[in-house]
């Protein structure tokens, strides 16, 4: 049985040419995490992050995704077709798959914040 | 030029245990991940696991776990896999295998090592 | 653990002819897929990644398209030293797997 969750940085906004971290973190399991996924709205992976071998970073997103905080990413450079969803799968044993959803807005404005609070989808 | 060495091929009996290595060269040896990929006689190809030189972090296919241990030593720039328990299963040549900086493609591979368990 | 099916163990081409090879995958992959090429005798050798982007060095000839669950391996033109094994592999969820191999055969 599946008990975990994920939670996600939620929807957040960024300024265009700024970066941004996308975080996802899992709880109320013990199940190990063997593997995260990071994928774009297209359904096209940025990033491959395995418990022991380390990142993999795809690329098409070389030059803008480094790896981390943590199992985590971040985005930089961003531009206004970064806008859309962002998900996180974590694969974990022996539970299975879990999939978190994040929201990316990126603004023209200077004003834009870039927030920062966990939900839980 | 990056190259991957394999130890030559063995002839062991059931039941006894082999470690096969795979020195390497001409790169910073604890950069990049080393795959272990078994192919059995006329068949496909087996991920058995990988391991992280820098810290020794390894990760298997669970139907290895058990039979095979990765290890390294860096001082040598050598990685190796240990068998155990050899039955006529494990007979097949087995390959190290080095991934890309960051990315998990095969990209340099040794000669491979033919393993044989006979009686 | 995700399996990779080549429908087509063996596949008979000519010189010149166009080819392609397909690898389905038992659950999504996304974009983690790469293909190899094993001639007689050799190691693998990786020709596509990602599962679009060509090796280093690796003629042009060869490329490889696909996202989901369904991967092509296409050579433009077959030339005679592209007799062997092509394998696919995913990487998205460990066990990392390959398909079954296809062999080209030249006519």
């Known amino acids: 049985m599946m008990t975990g969750t994920i939670e996600t940085t939620g929807n957040i906004s960024a300024k265009k040419g700024g970066s941004v971290i996308l975080q996802c973190h899992l709880s109320s399991t013990m199940a190990q995490v063997t593997q995260v996924n990071w994928e774009q709205h297209d359904h096209s992976l940025l990033a491959i992050r395995n418990a022991e071998l380390g990142w993999h970073i795809y690329p098409a997103f070389k030059d803008r995704v480094a790896p981390g905080p943590g199992l985590g990413l971040t985005l930089q450079s961003l531009t206004m077709n970064d806008t859309g969803e962002y998900f996180c799968t974590y694969h974990t044993y022996p539970d299975g798959t879990y999939r978190g959803r994040i929201f990316l807005e990126v603004l023209e404005s200077s004003v834009a914040e870039h927030s920062a609070r966990f939900q839980i989808p | 030029e990056v190259q991957l060495q394999q130890s030559g091929p063995e002839l062991v009996k059931p039941g006894a245990s082999v470690k096969i290595s795979c020195k390497t060269s001409?790169?910073?040896?604890?950069?990049?991940?080393m795959h272990w990929v078994k192919q059995s006689h006329g068949k496909s190809l087996e991920w058995i696991g990988g391991i992280n030189p820098n810290n020794g972090g390894t990760s298997y296919n669970q139907k290895f776990k058990g039979k095979a241990t990765l290890t390294v030593d860096k001082s040598s720039s050598t990685a190796y896999m240990e068998l155990r328990s050899l039955t006529s299963e494990d007979s097949a040549v087995y390959y190290c295998a080095r991934s890309g900086h960051m990315d998990y493609g095969y990209v340099y591979w040794g000669q491979g090592t033919t393993l044989t368990v006979s009686s | 653990d995700i399996v990779m099916t080549q429908s087509h163990k063996f596949m008979s081409t000519s010189v010149g002819d166009r080819v392609s090879i397909t690898c389905k995958a038992s659950q999504y992959v996304s974009t983690a897929v790469a293909w190899y090429q094993q001639k007689p005798g050799q190691s693998p050798k990786l020709l596509i990644y990602s599962p679009s982007y060509r090796y280093t060095g690796v003629p042009d000839r060869f490329t490889g398209s696909g996202s989901g669950t369904d991967f092509t391996f296409t050579i433009s033109s077959v030339q005679a030293e592209d007799l062997a094994v092509y394998y696919c592999q995913q990487h998205y969820s460990t066990p990392w797997t390959f398909g079954g191999g296809t062999k080209l055969e030249i006519k």
């Open positions: 001409g790169y910073t040896f604890t950069e990049y991940t």
